[in-house]
Amino acid sequence: PGPPPGPPRVSPDPRAELDSTVLLTRSLLADTRQLAAQLRDKFPADGDHNLDSLPTLAMSAGALGALQLPGVLTRLRADLLSYLRHVQWLRRAGGSSLKTLEPELGTLQARLDRLLRRLQLLMSRLALPQPPPDPPAPPLAPPSSAWGGIRAAHAILGGLHLTLDWAVRGLLLLKTRL
């Protein structure tokens, strides 16, 4: 007789899977909030900062009613990939002023990467259609000045915080619908 069969594969509880994703998202939200506050303390923002290359906001009060798990996870993953790319760019091209945000910026990048892998895993565990591989994104132009790097950091951390904030609320809502 051949080798004994392995233990039966237990299909994961989607609510538990979603729970751990919410925990990771919340944790990253807290990290981002802390780093954004650190940035504001060191380099106070003069008004609002935008960066055209950042993703547009995907969620709001009105969108919550129509949320579907595949759409939320796919969009969240795409947006977070964009933010990961921007954080990497910030660390590489942001200038010496932003070196004062290390090692926290590096930690944020690692945790963002971890959340993205978690989302990927969640999508495969829930047998959701996998998004096509991301097309190569055009390189981000280096900031025109040290102040340009700081302004970009304000925009990136502010946008990431807002995205994660809505992500937590959206994921919590979806959990109740499973």
Partner: antibody
Framework: EVQLLESGGGLVQPGGSLRLSCAAS????????MNWLRQAPGKGLEWVGV????????FYADFVKGRFTISRDNSKNTLYLQMNSLRAEDTAVYYC??????????WGQGTLVTVSS | QSVLTQPPSASGTPGQRVTISCSGS????????VNWYQQLPGTAPKLLIY???LLPSGVPDRFSGSKSGTSASLAISGLRSEDEADYYC???????????FGGGTKLTVL
């Protein structure tokens, strides 16, 4: 620094109308859902309604449906509350507040609306 | 009558730990995030805790939040005189499609 500044409050007769404004600064107004809340003298907080960042959706508390309308002008960084058919029980301090997700992270200082004959 | 239930008052002496409770139902606290606000006398409310237990920037870690089932609580350790204020819990309510609040708890520092 995020700032929200309400204006337009005052004394109005029952059945009358009033339009409140909330001027926002220090953040990208067009990225955030915005709310109105109120607090009657000596009472607790009460949510009035919310408008999505792009004004495509609005939700209201049952007690104001059909009487109050929330709108916004993203080009002017301003939120509005049009109040019609006012009643004595609408007397309160009205606050505007920003919503990044499930909570109100910044509030204005409030404007007092008094409905009395 | 508020949808969420809080004790109308609480008190403690400086240095003490005080807890304020907030109870609701599955349609609000059970399924949604709980937030806490502090309102000092004569001022606008201020966000104190969000997503059950997260602290916004600038809020001292003497404040903490927790949630279990359909109840939540706010704890303040090392009580100070400047903590004397009204405290409100809040959550989205799926049935009402609205944000709901507790009636508020007046905290007195003796």
């Amino acid at each position: 620094e995020v700032q929200l500044l309400e204006s337009g409050g005052g004394l109005v007769q029952p059945g009358g109308s009033l339009r409140l404004s909330c001027a926002a600064s220090g953040f990208t107004f067009s990225h955030y859902d915005m709310n109105w809340l109120r607090q009657a003298p000596g009472k607790g907080l009460e949510w009035v309604g919310v408008i999505s960042y792009d004004a495509s959706n609005k939700f209201y508390a049952d007690f104001v449906k059909g009487r109050f309308t929330i709108s916004r002008d993203n080009s002017k960084n301003t939120l509005y509350l049009q109040m019609n058919s006012l009643r004595a029980e609408d007397t309160a301090v009205y606050y505007c507040a920003r919503t990044p997700g499930s909570h109100f992270d910044y509030w204005g200082q409030g404007t007092l609306v008094t409905v009395s004959s | 009558q508020s949808v969420l239930t809080q004790p109308p008052s609480a008190s403690g002496t400086p240095g003490q730990r005080v807890t304020i409770s907030c109870s609701g139902s599955s349609s609000n606290i059970g399924n949604n995030a709980v937030n806490w606000y502090q309102q000092l006398p004569g001022t606008a409310p201020k966000l104190l805790i969000y997503y059950d237990d997260l602290l916004p920037s600038g809020v001292p870690d003497r404040f903490s939040g927790s949630k279990s089932g359909t109840s939540a609580s706010l704890a303040i350790s090392g009580l100070r005189s400047e903590d004397e204020a009204d405290y409100y819990c809040s959550a989205w309510d799926d049935s009402l499609n609205a944000v709901v609040f507790g009636g508020g708890t007046k905290l007195t520092v003796l």
